[in-house]
């Protein structure tokens, strides 16, 4: 093992470099020391280090992990910051062309519903909008309100049109009446299938991304232990006490100190591979029922289909709703 | 048959099309983004190795530091590091993650158990009864357009295919177009050169 | 310390098929996308497509679809690809290379393998 | 397929000196652009990635900045050694598509 050079006797590169970290050098010794009072560089001879520069070195190796873990993620936090909000504008798009797509079915085949369904078409969707975003909504609810809300208009305007519109009285019992016998079929029932199963995927691909930017954040920002501080301040800068300015730490003694210091972050991997894999099983799965695009972008043909269903029982529906709601519609009349 | 609407043109600032022929939809995004993401499948156990890679290490010198001395690269107390009587590596470990860093196990397991319960099982196809009336969807067959269920005459495909080149503007009030969301960009030559150290020779 | 060997240089018949090999070592084989990239003699640098070696998926740049197969032998970590109905066209210097860990960039290259193809 | 048109194609400099590349994608690439150095003989070597992200053990002299469409690389205090093609990549897509190359010689 070759002797350790004789360290500078004036401890003048030592001041130079130091003069970068912290200008100003009241710290530096002008020639050698003891350095009895040193707790990380611990000397074996004379030392141009101080204990306030051992402070500092501690200071920067810390600042120096933060900005090496900040440049490791910087593409991927990219990635995934840039593809969530991509994606949760995209989502949006998607919602609002719905919801055009459904009040231009409105407009262009029931003109007589226009007003009112283009109000519940439009709360239905934010509703939609707000799910998506992991408000607590509850998308049978969601979807039953829409009907409940709809039928109404459609019997007063299209069944029966020689009824009053303002009567609260028989709008109250339509909407009971609209569940009991299953006005719209089971159209409710299939539209609440597609809606939820897509509209949960949707969510958590979202809260996943979004947890993705949370980890890497996380990690980004990670505060390092005091120990982990000493062990790279000695790796890093302990040579410089003893004049080595040119040297380098040893490739092996850096990969353990490392994963010392990074113990506890790694011990995220097995988490995050779990996470990329399951991540990219979700997006397999995301098609037909389960690819909001789809769903939403076909219901106002649904929503359509569902409103021929009511007018092709019309004669039988008219009759059984003339009876269950006569005390409403009596009232009404009057 | 109901009016179907004209064909859905989206603001290309939101997705780019990826070929003028074949426009990007929302599927093939989420398939890129799942592409690339793999490819950081390795990020958290390589970091250790990218920090090392990324601060000065002797690589070509004859002489290293080891922590308390300057030794030869490839002599035995090259790797072991100079730290007796100081604190061991091994309790170092043994500490466990940082608090932050348990948390952050701890929803990213939340998460995985959320989305392994979401992956549905490929080739599921609704289910056709649709009312007791006996009236059922079309067959969508696997070659087909994606569609959805609706009744008889009254079914459409839709094309799961939104081109994002302009926002669709009806006879109708609608909407406006997003504004153009903020992308952070990285800061050119941010953290190129080791802090105050890379050039001190 | 990451290294990607190629397969040494070949001189085949036009027709049949030639397969080149990407023997890698340093690092965790599984873990990261194995590109490959054509240069023809002159010319810039196209890519044909990748191999990811966690599952086996392939991605490829359509203009190669029916020209190049990529596979792999998970317990030697290396790569391979095969190109079929040989032209003078296919004659060029093919690369390897990695990608993953901290970019979806290619961040380490094989020395490359000259395929001249010639009657 | 994004193109990317690489200038100039080919450029000669004095030692000491610096120069300038520049690569004009056909859209935007989200700063998912790469850089690299091409010797004969050998592969390509990564010297820039995510538009100004230092590979390890390149030397500061080497830079890269740009984002939307445009983007260029530079190397000052020119040495003996950076003699060589330059390439750049874009890697926004997934179908990979790589500048033409500017081969940099010695005045």
């Known amino acids: 093992q070759p002797p350790p050079p004789p360290p500078d006797a004036t401890c003048h590169q030592v001041r130079s470099f130091f003069q970068r970290l912290q200008p100003g050098l009241k710290w530096v010794p002008e020639t050698p020391v003891p350095g009895s009072d040193l707790q990380v560089c611990l000397p074996k001879g004379p030392t141009c280090c101080s204990r306030k520069m051992e402070e500092k070195y501690q200071l920067t190796a810390r600042l120096n992990m933060e900005q090496l873990l900040q440049s490791a993620s910087m593409e991927l936090k990219f990635l995934i910051i840039q593809n969530a909000a991509v994606f949760q504008e995209a989502f949006e798009i998607v919602v609002r062309h719905a919801k055009n797509y459904t009040n231009a079915m409105f407009k262009n085949n029931y003109p007589s519903l226009t007003p009112q369904a283009f109000e519940f078409v439009g709360e239905f969707f934010t509703d939609v909008s707000l799910y998506i975003l992991g408000s607590d909504i509850n998308v049978d609810d969601m979807v039953n309100e829409l009907f409940d809300s709809l039928f109404p208009v459609i019997y007063t305007q299209l069944m029966n049109p020689g009824l009053p519109d303002s009567a609260l009285d028989i709008n109250e019992c339509l909407r009971g009446a609209r569940r009991d016998l299953k006005v719209f079929g089971n159209f409710p029932k299939l539209i609440m299938t597609q809606v939820s199963k897509s509209l949960q995927v949707t969510r958590i691909f979202l809260q996943a991304l979004n947890l993705g930017i949370e980890v890497i954040n996380t990690t980004d920002h990670l505060k390092f232990s005091k120990d982990c501080g000493r062990m790279l301040t000695r790796m890093w800068y302990c040579s410089y006490c003893q004049g080595l300015m040119m040297v380098k730490p040893c490739g092996g003694y850096c990969n353990v100190v490392m994963q010392g210091c990074m113990a506890g972050v790694v011990e995220i991997d097995k988490y995050w591979r779990e996470y990329i894999l399951s991540l990219e099983e979700l997006v397999n799965g995301m098609y037909r029922i389960y690819d909001m695009e789809n769903v939403l972008l076909g219901l106002f043909s649904t929503i359509h289909d569902s409103i021929q269903y009511v007018q092709k029982n019309a004669g039988k529906l008219t009759t059984t709703i003339g009876k269950l709601c006569a005390h409403s519609q009596q009232r009404q009349y009057r | 048959s109901a009016y179907y609407p004209e064909d859905l043109f989206i603001d290309k600032k939101v997705l780019k099309v990826a070929h003028v022929e074949h426009e990007e939809t929302l599927s093939s995004r989420r398939r890129e983004l799942i592409q690339k993401l793999k490819s950081f499948i390795s990020f958290y156990s390589a970091l250790p190795g990218y920090i090392c890679s990324h601060s000065p290490v002797a690589e070509n010198d004859t002489l290293c530091w080891n922590g308390q001395e300057l030794v030869e690269r490839y002599s035995q107390k090259a790797a072991r590091n100079g730290m007796k009587n100081q604190f061991n590596l091994h309790e170092l470990k043994m500490k466990g993650p940082e608090p932050v860093v348990s948390q952050i196990i701890d929803k990213l397991k939340h998460i995985n158990q959320l989305l392994r319960t979401m992956s549905m099982p490929k080739g599921r196809v609704l289910d056709k009864n649709l009312d007791e009336e006996g009236f059922e969807s079309g067959d969508c067959g696997d070659d087909e357009d994606e569609c959805i269920g609706g009744s008889g005459d009254g079914m459409i495909k839709v094309k799961n295919q939104l081109r994002f080149l302009a926002e669709l503007a009806y006879d109708l009030d609608v909407d406006d177009a997003p504004g153009n969301s903020q992308q952070a960009t990285p800061k050119d030559n941010e953290i190129s050169t080791f802090h105050n150290l890379g050039n001190v020779h | 310390e990451v290294q990607l060997q190629q397969s040494g240089p070949v001189m085949v018949k036009p027709g049949p098929s030639v397969k080149i090999s990407c023997q890698t070592s340093?690092?965790?084989?599984?873990?990261?996308?194995i590109h490959w990239v054509k240069q023809s003699h002159g010319k810039s640098l196209e890519w044909i497509g990748l191999?990811?070696?966690?599952?086996?998926?392939?991605n490829y740049n359509q203009k190669f679809k029916d020209k190049a197969t990529l596979t792999l032998d998970t317990s030697s970590s290396t790569a391979y690809m095969e190109l079929n109905s040989l032209t003078s066209e296919d004659s060029a210097v093919y690369y390897c290379?990695?990608?993953?860990?901290?970019?979806?960039?290619?961040?380490?290259w094989g020395q490359g393998t000259s395929v001249t193809v010639s009657s | 397929d994004i193109q990317m048109t690489q200038s100039p194609s080919s450029l000669s400099a004095s030692l000491g000196g610096k120069v300038t590349i520049t690569c004009k994608a056909s859209?935007?690439?989200?700063?998912?652009i790469a850089w690299y150095q091409h010797k004969p003989g050998k592969g390509p070597r990564l010297l820039i990635h995510?538009?100004?992200t230092l590979q390890p053990g390149i030397p500061s002299r080497f830079s890269g900045s740009g984002s939307g469409r445009d983007y260029s690389f530079s190397i000052s205090n020119l040495e003996p050694e950076d003699i060589a093609t330059y390439y750049c990549?874009?890697?926004?897509?997934?179908?990979?598509?790589f500048g033409a190359g500017t081969k940099l010689e010695l005045k």
């Open positions: 290379a990695r990608a993953g860990g901290f970019s979806y960039a290619l961040n380490y």
């Open positions: 340093g690092f965790t084989f599984t873990d990261y996308y």
């Open positions: 990549l874009q890697y926004d897509n997934l179908l990979l598509t």
């Open positions: 995510f538009t100004s």
């Open positions: 859209q935007d690439i989200n700063n998912y």
């Open positions: 191999v990811f070696p966690y599952d086996g998926g392939t």
